[in-house]
C-alpha cells in the first residue's frame, strides 16, 4: 500500500495473507468459514511451494493470539483466468478446515448486486504489499482510502487504454495506491467487498495508471458454484 498508514490492529477480521513457504505473497479475503478469495495470478508465483493462508494477523512476524496459519485443501482459479491478462483474476482457496471465527477472524459480506460503485465513493484497500517505491515491505497491515474512478476515465488512452472491462473497476492512484504484494486483497466500500486487487505488473502511485480491481459482483455465480 503506497501513501497509506498502519491499519487498526484486527479491525479488518476478513483480511488474509496468502503465503508461500512462510513468506507473504498476496492478500486475500475470507468470504466464508472455509474459503478465501484472492487473485489467480498469485498462484503463478507459488510455483511448487507450499501455499498457506494466515488469518487473524496484524503483524506478519510477531506472535498474536488470534493468528493462525491454515493449509490449503484446494485452490480454484477462475477457469478463464490466463497468465497474460488480468481478466477474471480471481482465485478461491479452500482451507484445510473451517476457520476458527472470533473478533479478529470473520468473513466479509461480498457484493452480489451487479451494479457499478458510484464514482467518487471512498473505498478501503488493505494489505501487506510494498509501502515505498524502494520496495520496502511492512510487517504490519497497512490500508488506504481511495476514491472509485469512473470506467470511461480509466479507459482513456492516457490511462489504461480500453483494457478495463465491465467486470473490473478502477480506483484513483495519485500517490495513494495498492501495489506489489497487495494483489488478491479486498477493496471494501461501505462495509461490503466490492473488488479484489488485480495482480498485473502495473506501475503504482501514478495517477495516470489507476488501480484495477476485479468486481466480485460480476462473478457471483462462479463464487457461489465453487462454495456450494
Amino acid at each position: 500500500i503506497l501513501g497509506g498508514r498502519e491499519a487498526e490492529a484486527h479491525a479488518r477480521p476478513y483480511m488474509a495473507s496468502v503465503q508461500v513457504n512462510g513468506e507473504h505473497l498476496c492478500g486475500g479475503v475470507l468470504v466464508a468459514e472455509q474459503w478465501v478469495l484472492s487473485a489467480a495470478h498469485c498462484l503463478e508465483d507459488a510455483a511448487d511451494g507450499k501455499v498457506q493462508v494466515l488469518l487473524g494477523a496484524h503483524s506478519l512476524s510477531q506472535p498474536e493470539p488470534s493468528k493462525r496459519l491454515y493449509d490449503v485443501l484446494r485452490a480454484v482459479p477462475h477457469p478463464d483466468s490466463r497468465p497474460d491478462t488480468i481478466d477474471h483474476d480471481l482465485l478461491l482457496l479452500q482451507l484445510s478446515e473451517k476457520a476458527t471465527l472470533g473478533p479478529a477472524v470473520r468473513p466479509l459480506p461480498w457484493q452480489r448486486v451487479d451494479r457499478d460503485v458510484e464514482p467518487g465513493t471512498l473505498c478501503d484497500v488493505a494489505g501487506w504489499g510494498i509501502v515505498s517505491h524502494a520496495g520496502r515491505r511492512p510487517d504490519r497491515l497497512q490500508h488506504v482510502l481511495l476514491p472509485v474512478l469512473d470506467r470511461a476515465t480509466c479507459n482513456r488512452r492516457t490511462h489504461h487504454d480500453g483494457a478495463i472491462t465491465q467486470r473490473m473497476m478502477c480506483a484513483e492512484s495519485n500517490r495513494r495506491d495498492s501495489c506489489k504484494g497487495d494483489s488478491g486483497g479486498p477493496l471494501v466500500c461501505g462495509g461490503v467487498l466490492e473488488g479484489v486487487v488485480t495482480s498485473g505488473s502495473r506501475v503504482c502511485g501514478n495517477r495516470k495508471k489507476p488501480g484495477i480491481y476485479t468486481r466480485v459482483a460480476s462473478y457471483a455465480a462462479w463464487i457461489d458454484s465453487v462454495l456450494a
Epitope: E23, L25, I130, S132, H133, A134, G135, R137, K180, G181
Partner: antibody, heavy 113, light 106 residues
Amino acid sequence: EVQLQQSGAELVKPGASVRLSCTASGFNIKHTYMHWVSQRPERGLEWIGKIDPANGNTKYDPKFQGKATITADTSSNTVYLQLSSLTSEDTAVYYCLNAMEYWGQGTSVTVSS
Amino acid sequence: QSVLTQSPAIMSASPGEKVTMTCSANSSVSDMYWYQQRPGSSPRLLIYDTSNLASGVPVRFSGSGSGTSYSLTISRMEAEDAATYYCQQWSTYPWTFGGGTKLEIK
C-alpha cells in the same frame, strides 16, 4: 535471515564490460525491488537503478542509462549489474540492495590498463 | 534533480553527548532515509520514512523533519556510532544521497 552475496572483485581494462552478480537468500527477490548503488570516494553514494524481478521492469538514474543494465534471474534468486564501455571513472564499489534496506557486501571494480 | 546537502561534513562528539546532523534539500521532498556506514563496511539502514527506526537499530537514534529540512539525532553518543551518515530522498527520480556527515568520537 536476509543475505545478499555479491560476486568477487574485478580488475578490468578500459572499454571492456563486466557483469556483477548478487544472490539473495532468506527472501524471494520477486516479492520486492532490487537496487544497485555505486560508491567512490570523490562522488559518494549514487543510486544506479532498480529492477522488479517479477516482471523485469527497470528504472535507472539517467546518468547511468546506457552504462548500466540490471537484470534478474528469479530461478536462482540472483540479480545482475552489467557495466559497459568501462573507463577509470567507473572504478568504484558497487552494492546490491533489497528495497534499500539490506545491502550486499559490495563488489570492487577497478578499471585500469 | 533533488540535491541533498549534509552538514556538518565532519563532526566529533564525546560519549554520552547528544548529536544532531542535518540534511537540506534544494526542493521539497516528502520522506528521508538515513544510513550509517562504518569504516570498511556496507551502509546500513537506520531510519526510513523520515522518522521510523529500521529493524535492530538502537532507540537512541531518531529522525525528524519535513519539506527541505531533515535531521538525524543520536540522544547519547556511543563509541560504536563513529561512522559516516548519509541521507537519501525517495520523492523524485533520480533518487539521490547526501554527501555524508562523518561522525568521530572525541
